[in-house]
Amino acid sequence: LVPHLGDREKRDSVCPQGKYIHPQNNSICCTKCHKGTYLYNDCPGPGQDTDCRECESGSFTASENHLRHCLSCSKCRKEMGQVEISSCTVDRDTVCGCRKNQYRHYWSENLFQCFNCSLCLNGTVHLSCQEKQNTVCTCHAGFFLRENECVSCSNCKKSLECTKLCLPQIENVKGTEDSGTT
């Protein structure tokens, strides 16, 4: 099966790598613009230079292209706790990340929020916190894991999933209550 190509891909495939087909004259292949620049004017003829201009401040192109405009630089989302790792340059978009001892929770492929890594109080670190994953904790006896925090079994209600982990404690509490009714 032949993969489906978009119009731009079809046009580009006619020309050698690093060149694109002139939009008004399909017998001319123009040289693509370098990263950090954009297409101002197509080349006037074969072997003649494409008119490429450098991206203005606040915009970029990260690869060779024949874009009519540079792409706008991304802004790190402060409301998501993001910080700027590196500023936008003409040939590279802004790089956003999280502070030390934080991890990224991805709401979608292009949106993440920063959260503090769990410290595993009343437990031990099973897997260390990573860029895109919170610490995985293992709880000490008498504690159960709820939303990645070790919570005392005294907070375990019978309807919750903690009942198996906290069964001895629940039995003890029940036994104590029963012994006081004689």
Partner: nanobody, 121 residues
Framework: EVQLLESGGGLVQPGGSLRLSCAAS????????MAWVRQAPGKGQEWVSF????????YYADSVKGRFTISRDNSKNTLYLQMNSLRAEDTAVYYC??????????????WGQGTLVTVSS
């Protein structure tokens, strides 16, 4: 076919409460992050709150922190927004939205038709 149907909007006095619901169908609800987004008259869209698949991770806009609570019931395929201490500036159409998984120009791929919340005395 994906469908998101909001309900629970209405007219409420300042300081009052409302609970919005969003009934989801046409997809595996528990596998997707969900959101509430609002649009006030003549203004742009504002993210209100997000909730993760299992409900453990949430996001709230600063303007609603401490007043609104997002929750979900995956067994009922329903998303909720409990709105307390409502203010005039909360007046807007509230939309339930499903996060897209793959990269798109928008982070949401499906929206409900919206429910109007009016806060006025």
């Amino acid at each position: 076919e994906v469908q998101l149907l909001e309900s629970g909007g209405g007219l409420v006095q300042p300081g009052g409460s409302l609970r919005l619901s969003c009934a989801a169908s046409g997809f595996t609800f528990g596998e997707y992050n969900m959101a509430w987004v609002r649009q006030a008259p003549g203004k742009g869209q504002e993210w209100v709150s997000f909730i993760s698949t299992g409900g453990h991770v949430t996001y709230y806009a600063d303007s609603v922190k401490g007043r609104f609570t997002i929750s979900r019931d995956n067994s009922k395929n329903t998303l909720y927004l409990q709105m307390n201490s409502l203010r005039a500036e909360d007046t807007a159409v509230y939309y339930c939205a499903k996060f897209s998984v793959r990269f798109r120009s928008s982070i949401f791929d499906y929206w409900g038709q919206g429910t109007l919340v009016t806060v006025s005395s």
